[in-house]
């Protein structure tokens, strides 16, 4: 199934003019994501059942090895490039989590809904970051990495990788909201 965010090799060919207050909109989207991240994390680990709720440090710790770095003290351009990479990584990861949860927890509709809503905001954020990079800094291409593919993992690994990713998401989104 298609992932919610499929970034293209950007060529700075923006079809529509960028939003007037682009940076404000980016800040608003980051604040929105930060405001709902903890609730999403709780909803996720609760839906997985035991042993997850009682082993959060071990099973849901934010130790995601290949996660793109972020340096809060960089220039706006450098921070936007790093934000772009992070949003692409989170978007594909969230797509994998959503796909897995529809199979593993088909009746957890509130979790599915929150995952989809988060993916929607990330999609909008990605569009805005790209617009800013193209219009102000003429950056048309950013090398990206994608979240881990969970398709071939067993049930426990699917759940654990999802929990770790959402633990990392909760942590990084607070940093990003602060940095912009």
């Amino acid at each position: 199934s298609p992932l919610p965010i499929t970034p293209v090799n950007a060529t700075c060919a923006i079809r529509h003019p960028c939003h007037n207050n682009l940076m404000n909109q980016i800040r608003s989207q980051l604040a929105q994501l930060n405001g709902s991240a903890n609730a999403l994390f709780i909803l996720y680990y609760t839906a997985q059942g035991e042993p997850f709720p009682n082993n959060l440090d071990k099973l849901c710790g934010p130790n995601v090895t290949d996660f793109p770095p972020f340096h809060a003290n960089g220039t706006e351009k450098a921070k936007l490039v790093e934000l772009y990479r992070i949003v692409v990584y989170l978007g594909t990861s969230l797509g994998n989590i959503t796909r897995d949860q529809k199979i593993l927890n088909p009746s957890a509709l509130s979790l599915h809904s929150k995952l989809n809503a988060t993916a929607d905001i990330l999609r909008g954020l990605l569009s805005n970051v790209l617009c800013r990079l193209c219009s102000k800094y003429h950056v048309g291409h950013v090398d990206v990495t994608y979240g881990p593919d969970t398709s071939g993992k067993d049930v426990f690994q699917k759940k654990k990788l999802g929990c770790q990713l959402l633990g990392k998401y909760k942590q990084i989104i607070a940093v990003l909201a602060q940095a912009f």
């Epitope: 035991e50 593993l104 398709s151 690994q157």
Partner: antibody, heavy 118, light 106 residues
């Protein structure tokens, strides 16, 4: 359906490769092929599984690591390479298929007999 | 890593009676437990998956229950055709596992 082949009489310390072939279908991306064995008069013993999609994730029983290797060799075949065989490896070897999330085996081959003896 | 313990190892039952087979996991496997029937010289046949869902074409005389670590397979109105070995199997975690199957009940 699934069918195993390659079962044979082999000498101790010898090697053997078993093949699991899908008939009437090709492996879809969301599919696992696993190997399970059964020694004469004994229970079912899981050996290994492979995800036949792009990532090719593999899972092995702790005792099988190093001596057994599971591989996808085509869109319809998966092999199990076995080395340093002993009499304890004498068994009927089954291949089994599992759909995502791979928690149960809904398709089984008839099995192929491997005998390790001098 | 979950280990599966199945009891009893063997049992006899009169035709028309009820059989109860238990399967215990050494740690939680949620509801990812399946049951198989195997007759001599044949391949295993899936009976039940996700603890209580009957596989296609399987008689409703077979009933599965349980979650977490304790699971049960019940066969009511036993027929001669039910004479077989029954195995439970956990499908929750395949990493660092000795065997996903229980020892079997004959």
């Amino acid at each position: 359906s699934l069918e195993e082949s390659g079962g044979d009489l082999v000498k101790p310390e010898g090697s053997l490769t078993l093949t699991c072939t899908a008939s009437g279908f090709s492996f879809s991306t969301d599919y696992w092929i696993c190997w399970v064995r059964q020694a004469p008069g004994k229970g079912l013993e899981w050996i290994a599984c492979i995800y036949v999609g792009t990532s090719g994730d593999t899972y092995y029983a702790t005792w099988a690591k190093g001596r057994f290797t599971i591989s996808k060799t085509s869109s319809t075949t998966v092999t199990l390479q076995m080395t340093s065989l002993t009499a304890a490896d004498t068994a009927t070897y089954f291949c089994a298929g599992a759909d995502n999330p791979y928690d149960y085996f809904n398709l089984w081959g008839p099995g192929t007999l491997v005998t390790v003896s001098s | 890593t979950p280990d599966m313990t199945q009891t009893p190892a063997s049992m006899e039952v009169a035709v028309g009676g009820t059989v109860t087979i238990k399967c215990q996991a050494s740690e939680t496997i949620s509801g990812y437990l399946s049951w198989y029937q195997q007759k001599p010289g044949q391949r295993p046949k899936l009976l039940m998956y996700r603890a209580s869902t009957l596989a296609s074409g399987v008689s409703s005389r077979f009933k599965g229950s349980g979650s977490g670590t304790q699971f049960t397979l019940t066969i009511s109105g036993v027929e001669c055709a039910d004479a077989a070995t029954y195995y439970c199997q956990q499908g929750y975690s395949y990493s660092d596992t000795d065997n996903v199957f229980g020892g079997g009940t004959e």
